[in-house]
């Protein structure tokens, strides 16, 4: 059976500006020309979509204008960046890859990246 394996880091720490980046890599069982990458957030047993983008192999990954995600692609590797994160957004972020075209369709799901977000301490007032 041809399976599609998806690899992503286990843990990532967001920057003080609330930006987290990680690589999502997939082993393609076929020669896909169109790929969809989705970032899912799993909290308890609820899974929600954070962002999604479809790209043609060899072209750039394009998220919607209002998306909190950006990314670049290189072969079977996608570099994902999620911005605007706050402490309450700490959780498991799953990379889902779908080979959309040509058929057959293939689904691949990573084990998830635990993203830790720490809200920056407010700057103390200065007495000058």
């Amino acid at each position: 059976c041809k399976a599609m394996h998806v690899a992503q880091p286990a843990v990532v720490l967001a920057s003080s500006r609330g930006i987290a980046s990680f690589v999502c890599e997939y082993a393609s069982p076929g020669k896909a020309t169109e790929v969809r990458v989705t970032v899912l957030r799993q909290a308890d047993s609820q899974v929600t979509e954070v962002c999604a983008a479809t790209y043609m192999m060899g072209n750039e990954l394009t998220f919607l204008d209002d998306s909190i995600c950006t990314g670049t692609s290189s072969g079977n590797q996608v570099n994902l960046t999620i911005q605007g994160l706050r402490a309450m957004d700490t959780g498991l972020y799953i990379c889902k890859v779908e080979l959309m075209y040509p058929p057959p369709y293939y689904l691949g799901i990573g084990n998830g990246t635990q993203i830790y977000v720490i809200d920056p301490e407010p700057c103390p007032d200065s007495d000058f």
Epitope: C1, K2, A3, M4, H5, E34, R36, T38, L40, V47, T48, E49, A52, T54, I94, K96, E98, M100, Y101, P103, P104, Y105, Y106, L107, G108, I109
Partner: antibody
């Protein structure tokens, strides 16, 4: 509905309560007293589709995301297409998590 | 398999699903169907319970052999059960197992 062999029929499935365009949607059928048979799937913006061999070339799946509606155009119907047809939503992690109540299609002369 | 499982309420039910080839990344789901109703998702990949499914239902397995276990049968659990692979098209269903009252 009841339709004669060789004729056509279009099924529709209206969804609500979720962001329709963010999910793939399947058609699954069940002949009387038989098991579930996958028929077709359509993904997201409607450009990518896949069909079971038994319906390829006869059935066409489509969707209108502005109307939250899924369609199945069935042409050249045969007696063996008689079944209850279900639409089902693809969950974020892949299985079919919500199913319509089903529509009975009877192909008979 | 088997096609029909005849058991009594309170008993343990073990249903098996065997694939002809290894299932991609264990993308296997189990559905329950009662007469006149649409199927309902129970378990996916292959041991996560769907929302609202009691913990008496559990799934296990990998590769080609998968199992759905109902630890203690309640009257409402007597129904038809189907497995399905959803990792690649075509998205095939198993033939189904009927769990009926002995």
């Amino acid at each position: 509905g009841v339709v004669q062999p060789g004729r056509s029929l279009r099924l529709s499935c209206v969804a609500s309560g979720f962001i329709f365009s963010s999910h793939g949607i399947h058609w699954v059928r069940q002949a009387p007293g038989k098991g579930l048979e996958w028929v077709a799937v359509i993904w997201y913006d409607g450009r990518n589709k896949d069909y079971a061999d038994s319906v390829k070339g006869r059935f066409t799946i489509s969707r209108d995301n502005s109307k939250n509606t899924l369609y199945l155009q069935m042409n050249s119907l045969r007696a063996e297409d008689t079944a209850v047809y279900y639409c089902a939503r693809v969950a974020p992690l892949g299985p079919l998590d919500y199913w319509g109540q089903g529509t009975l299609v009877t192909v008979s002369s | 398999s088997p096609g029909t499982l005849s058991l009594s309420p309170g008993e343990r039910a073990t249903l098996s699903c065997r694939a002809s080839q290894s299932i991609s990344s264990n993308f296997l789901a189990w559905y329950q169907q009662k007469p006149g109703q649409a199927p309902r998702l129970l378990i996916y990949r292959p041991s996560s319970r769907a929302t609202g499914i009691p913990d008496s239902f559990s799934g296990s397995g990998s590769g080609t052999d998968f199992t759905l276990t109902i630890s203690r049968l309640e009257p409402e659990d007597f129904a038809l059960y189907y497995c399905q692979q959803y990792g690649t098209s075509p998205f095939t269903f198993g033939p189904g197992t009927k769990v009926d009252i002995k």
